[in-house]
Amino acid sequence: SIPWNLERITPPRYRADEYQPPDGGSLVEVYLLDTSIQSDHREIEGRVMVTDFENVPEEDGTRFHRQASKCDSHGTHLAGVVSGRDAGVAKGASMRSLRVLNCQGKGTVSGTLIGLEFIRKSQLVQPVGPLVVLLPLAGGYSRVLNAACQRLASAGVVLVTAAGNFRDDACLYSPASAPEVITVGATNAQDQPVTLGTLGTNFGRCVDLFAPGEDIIGASSDCSTCFVSQSGTSQAAAHVAGIAAMMLSAEPELTLAELRQRLIHFSAKDVINEAWFPEDQRVLTPNLVAALPPSTHGAGWQLFCRTVWSAHSGPTRMATAVARCAPDEELLSCSSFSRSGKRRGERMEAQGGKLVCRAHNAFGGEGVYAIARCCLLPQANCSVHTAPPAEASMGTRVHCHQQGHVLTGCSSHWEVEDLGTHKPPVLRPRGQPNQCVGHREASIHASCCHAPGLECKVKEHGIPAPQEQVTVACEEGWTLTGCSALPGTSHVLGAYAVDNTCVVRSRDVSTTGSTSEGAVTAVAICCRSRHLAQASQELQ
Amino acid sequence: QEDEDGDYEELVLALRSEEDGLAEAPEHGTTATFHRCAKDPWRLPGTYVVVLKEETHLSQSERTARRLQAQAARRGYLTKILHVFHGLLPGFLVKMSGDLLELALKLPHVDYIEEDSSVFAQ
């Protein structure tokens, strides 16, 4: 019968006793930077080309016995998970292996850098189809390793890496912390985060998604027909590399940004038990388990968005946090979140010719996060319209006044330490969907975009009584682009998007005063692109 | 890697050369920074990646590496250039004493220097 991990990544319409996805990734080359491999293993024979690249440190230990089967164990298993005949994800993908880890699974940042450079030079000398680079390794945070990954990604290469097995914040490790890399955490057959002894999968905002990574059957280097079960975020990353290979084989022109958005979009949502993660990391960690798309074609009509969290600002009064979208993505909205509730809102601002989302801490606050909603919107022209604090009883408002521009997000930012909580909340006058409304002491920022066929609508969910969380979701066919809270008063901790749902968090109800102060409205802006839908229909 | 600790090839004689002049001094006001792994046991002191500014050409990378060797030799230090990077990042990998970091950070074109560190199979 089909191994649990292959079943888990297969959409229901393809499920059978055998794992037979429609395209095996035959147009894609996957580079594996790992240990040496047993290339004559029946699972991978003829599928993996061992390059002559080797850059590894000496093994540790007062007595070290080099056994080929032990030296090849990690890499052979991963090659099998990516493209193995029986237990592989992308059975048609061809692979090339580079040895950057020694027989004990240890390598160096410098060796990995030289390996990445080798791949880039190979790509220049002999350009082939889409390239996926699998980095099933991790070290401490490294500026230079992250920079090399960024350069390779900007050359059109898709990099997939292990989040790390340290039961820790993935942002403290490289290449897991490189924003351009697809970083993969590990889950088990119960869709729970993988525990590895005292340790386990890494988590946090630097993880893009999770994938099967416990008890994964794959090629064993003990013999040419042996199989073995291994666990770790390397195995999880290998699944995503295989899925990426299949998606790229079906749509070779996909950019990294498009691929990442699709991986997120087709993942299983909200199946991971977040209680396993440290409390302060739960909101930052994506609750996504990778899966193949139900159909390899025809996803192009969708408006894809993802949520990007910034690093924590730190507690100083003037501290700020910045969240950025990938180069090919549009920032369609910006929100902020603070666990203490002490924040001064957020705003979108230009930085290096691109919009970024900046959140502001307040005096006595423990720090803030900026949350960017990053979307794929071809031919988009977006700008930010700002209204300064109105000081009028009706509150501050701003709208998209340019012809053909629609509202995709609202942000508010205030200079005062605490927005007055005694004033009644201002709710949006009905029938004015292109308008942002906020507290009279706040400046309001509207993200206004023009793109072919783009249409958006505002959806609100207000509750009169205090509640820790208010949510509002976009319906089928619409994509959440903006998420904000009304009013912006101090008991609101902030707003953020989780998949297609806008979440507004408030202080613990027991600490909230009157019910009028507790009234909170979650405001979602839901968009779709008729243009993308038409283009997709024309293709079919 | 072919070399072992203490086995320094390419020993550089302390010859005064055009490489050792002060032409191409670092641009005013720009300070190169030094980075190392926050996890001490994973550090590999003695090997450093010298990353040069983005538009640096291969010839300049090689020249900067030779200049470092010459200046180090004048101070009685042996260095070994293990690799010159080009294609992804401009720069070079050098085996040298940590005592030379201050000197290396002042070289022209240097953006930052990172001490090598370990990575592990996951």
Epitope: Q67, G105 | D40, P41, F120
Partner: antibody, heavy 122, light 111 residues
Framework: QVQLVQSGAEVKKPGSSVKVSCKAS????????MHWVRQAPGQGLEWMGL????????YYADSAKGRFTISRDNSKNTLYLQMNSLRSDDTAVYYC???????????????WGQGTTVTVSS | QSALTQPPSVSGSPGQSVTISCTGT????????VSWYQQLPGTAPKLMIY???KRPSGVPDRFSGSKSGNTASLTISGLQTGDEADYYC???????????FGTGTRVTVLG
């Protein structure tokens, strides 16, 4: 649950040998390095040695070198400590302990056996 | 194998905080991860802290670790009678190519 179960107490004469075992359960034994640690009566902990998860590498304390050998049988999920030329100062409780993770955390011990008392007396 | 240096004993009343120091050299604590172990009377040691300041799941957050230079510290806040035990620090020593434990500290809860 995860546990290490050690063999029973031993009483030995000076100059003799003994082999202590440690059987692992409820975890993937061949994924973890293993340590031996001893504790003489009323004394502190003394590390004896470490064996890599696949048996390919090892380290020993000076006091164990030459006389003590650590081995493992991954097919039986069992770790061994062979002690030769026993002396009276080898009298101690011997603990096996699991190394916390892969190579990057081999040196912390997160699961301990219940201990085996070895008494060396004439 | 020379041990890391710990005070022989520390004591405190219930609810108080106590700190145990562990002093080594640059070849162990200064450049290696430090772990802390608790040994209750008559039982095997138990890992309380690893990599200077991380707690395995199940270890209360009353236990915290830190490191400065060649000295590591374990702080037990909100002391409880169940915390009475011997505590050992431990670290790899790169010059010895071996693991070294601290001399051990007995924690006594008064009253």
């Amino acid at each position: 649950q995860v546990q290490l179960v050690q063999s029973g107490a031993e009483v030995k004469k000076p100059g003799s040998s003994v082999k202590v075992s440690c059987k692992a359960s409820a975890f993937t034994f061949d994924s973890f390095g293993m340590h031996w640690v001893r504790q003489a009566p009323g004394q502190g902990l003394e590390w004896m040695g470490l064996l890599w998860s696949d048996g390919s590498g090892e380290y020993y304390a000076d006091s164990a070198k030459g006389r003590f050998t650590i081995s493992r049988d991954n097919s039986k999920n069992t770790l061994y400590l062979q002690m030769n030329s026993l002396r009276s100062d080898d009298t101690a409780v011997y603990y096996c302990a699991r190394a916390m993770g892969a190579i990057y955390y081999y040196y912390a011990m997160d699961v301990w056996g219940q201990g085996t008392t070895v008494t060396v007396s004439s | 194998q020379s041990a890391l240096t710990q005070p022989p004993s520390v004591s405190g009343s219930p609810g108080q905080s106590v700190t145990i120091s562990c002093t080594g050299t640059s070849s162990n604590i200064g450049n290696q991860f430090v772990s802390w172990y608790q040994q209750l009377p008559g039982t095997a040691p138990k890992l309380m802290i690893y990599e200077y300041n991380k707690r395995p799941s199940g270890v209360p957050d009353r236990f915290s670790g830190s490191k400065s230079g060649n000295t590591a510290s374990l702080t037990i806040s909100g002391l409880q009678t169940g915390d009475e035990a011997d505590y050992y620090c431990g670290s790899w020593d790169s010059s010895l190519s071996g693991y070294v434990f601290g001399t051990g500290t007995r924690v006594t809860v008064l009253g």
